[in-house]
Interface confidence: medium
């Protein structure tokens, strides 16, 4: 289980139509459920039920994406309409390019990710989890513009970390 | 069909309560936030406030001009949303309708065809 | 808070691009919906995310957000697109949902 180094962009655009951007720093692990490759794009934040939906008008991304995932505690979705798997693939299916779950919550998602599939799908999927987790979702949570770039080894130059 | 239905508008005189309802069909009530927006005659669209899933928390906010005033609850054993508006002043006469928000964009792809809330004397 | 700033009305001939615009305070940064109201209806959903079209939004439909302008950009403009145009964000510092004041877009003719 090797570390995924993640920055997140976020993007404060300026009245001239630049943009200044700051980025936070944190760490995940490429999971067995997918590939230890690098990746980025726009953030998404999909929530887990949203996942569970298979029809048209749900695919509502273009292709290239990162998709945030928060998992519930497992008591609060008891039968879940999708294995945590199957929700790295639905996600990849509608055009994610990388999926990371926030399992705080439900570090059992960790060995579910990790048990190996004989057809681990081809693009990376990242757990995180304690101090890395609140980083990100405070982050995702401001609904602004941001991206995630994922990275199987450290950034070369170090990065100016802006802690949101 | 994916569908909301608001009931419970009518007139009410200032410091007046009036309770709306939104009845939802189609989809699984329970995975969604839902929010009120209202237009009063001849204006704009104004937020009035939301609700989230319960797995969300279900929680609760509410714009300034309604905040103390109006409650939002849902029953999602009835899959319905509920907007219990007390205190009612003449510039709450508005349409109000009910709306679905795609999970986490806060964008609204569903809508309810509105109820009718008349305040005055 | 972030308000929302829009044109009260813009005209176009039919066949002819129409372009309304939606300002505020570093909008770019903010993710903009857009929706379209005709008379007596509720609203409709044809812009989110900036770009996005939800299914069954014609193609002519089409949308950019950058500095401190979001624009909604109708190509071909039909005689069915004459509405109300309402562009909306939600502001992350007060949790509120935004709207802009409302566009009527006339199509002449």
């Known amino acids: 289980k090797e570390t995924a180094f993640v920055e997140v962009v976020l993007f404060e655009s300026s009245p001239s139509g630049d943009y200044t951007t700051y980025t936070t720093g944190l760490t995940g692990r490429f999971s067995r459920a997918g590939a230890t490759l690098s990746a980025e794009g726009e953030i998404v934040q999909m929530h887990p039920l949203g996942l569970c939906n298979n029809n048209d008008e749900e695919d509502l991304y273009e292709y290239g994406w990162v998709g945030v995932v928060k998992l519930e505690q497992p008591e609060l979705d008891p039968k879940p309409c999708l294995t945590v798997l199957g929700k790295a693939k639905r996600a990849v299916q509608r055009g994610a390019t990388a999926v990371i779950f926030d399992v705080s919550e439900n570090p059992e998602a960790i060995d579910q990710l990790n048990q190996g599939s004989e057809d681990p799908l081809k693009r990376p999927v990242v757990y995180v989890k304690g101090a890395d987790a609140i980083k990100l979702m405070n982050i995702v949570n401001k609904q602004k513009v941001a991206r995630a770039r994922i990275q199987h080894r450290p950034p070369r130059q170090p990065t100016e970390y802006f802690d949101m | 069909e994916v569908q909301l239905v608001e009931s419970g508008g009518g007139l009410v005189k200032p410091g007046g309560s009036l309770r709306l309802s939104c009845a939802a069909s189609?989809?699984?009530?329970?995975?969604?936030?839902i929010h009120w927006v209202r237009q009063a005659p001849g204006k704009g669209l104004e937020w009035v406030g939301r609700?989230?899933?319960?797995?969300?928390?279900?929680?609760?906010e509410y714009a300034a001009p309604v905040k103390g005033r109006f409650t939002i609850s849902r029953d999602d054993s009835k899959n319905t949303l509920y907007l219990q508006m007390n205190s009612l002043k003449t510039e709450d006469t508005a349409v109000y309708y009910c709306?679905?928000?795609?999970?986490?964009?806060?964008?609204?792809?569903?809508w309810g065809q509105g109820t009718l809330v008349t305040v005055s004397s | 808070d972030i308000e929302l700033t829009q044109p009260p009305s813009v005209s176009v001939s039919p066949g002819q691009t129409a372009s309304i615009t939606c300002s505020g305070d570093?909008?770019?940064?903010?993710?903009v919906h857009w929706y379209q109201q005709k008379p007596g209806q509720a609203p409709v959903l044809v812009i989110y995310?900036?770009?996005q079209r939800p299914s069954g939004i014609p193609e002519r439909f089409s949308g950019s957000n950058s500095g401190n302008t979001a624009t909604l950009t109708i190509s071909g403009t039909q005689a069915e697109d004459d509405a109300d145009y309402y562009c909306?964000?939600?502001?992350?510092?007060?949790?509120?949902?935004?709207f802009g004041g409302g566009t009527k877009l006339t199509v002449l003719g």
């Open positions: 709306a679905r928000a795609i999970y986490y964009l806060e964008a609204f792809d569903v």
């Open positions: 189609g989809f699984t009530f329970s995975d969604y936030g």
């Open positions: 609700i989230k899933s319960k797995t969300d928390g279900g929680i609760t």
């Open positions: 570093s909008l770019g940064s903010y993710y």
């Open positions: 995310r900036n770009k």
């Open positions: 909306a964000t939600y502001d992350s510092s007060s949790w509120w949902n935004v």
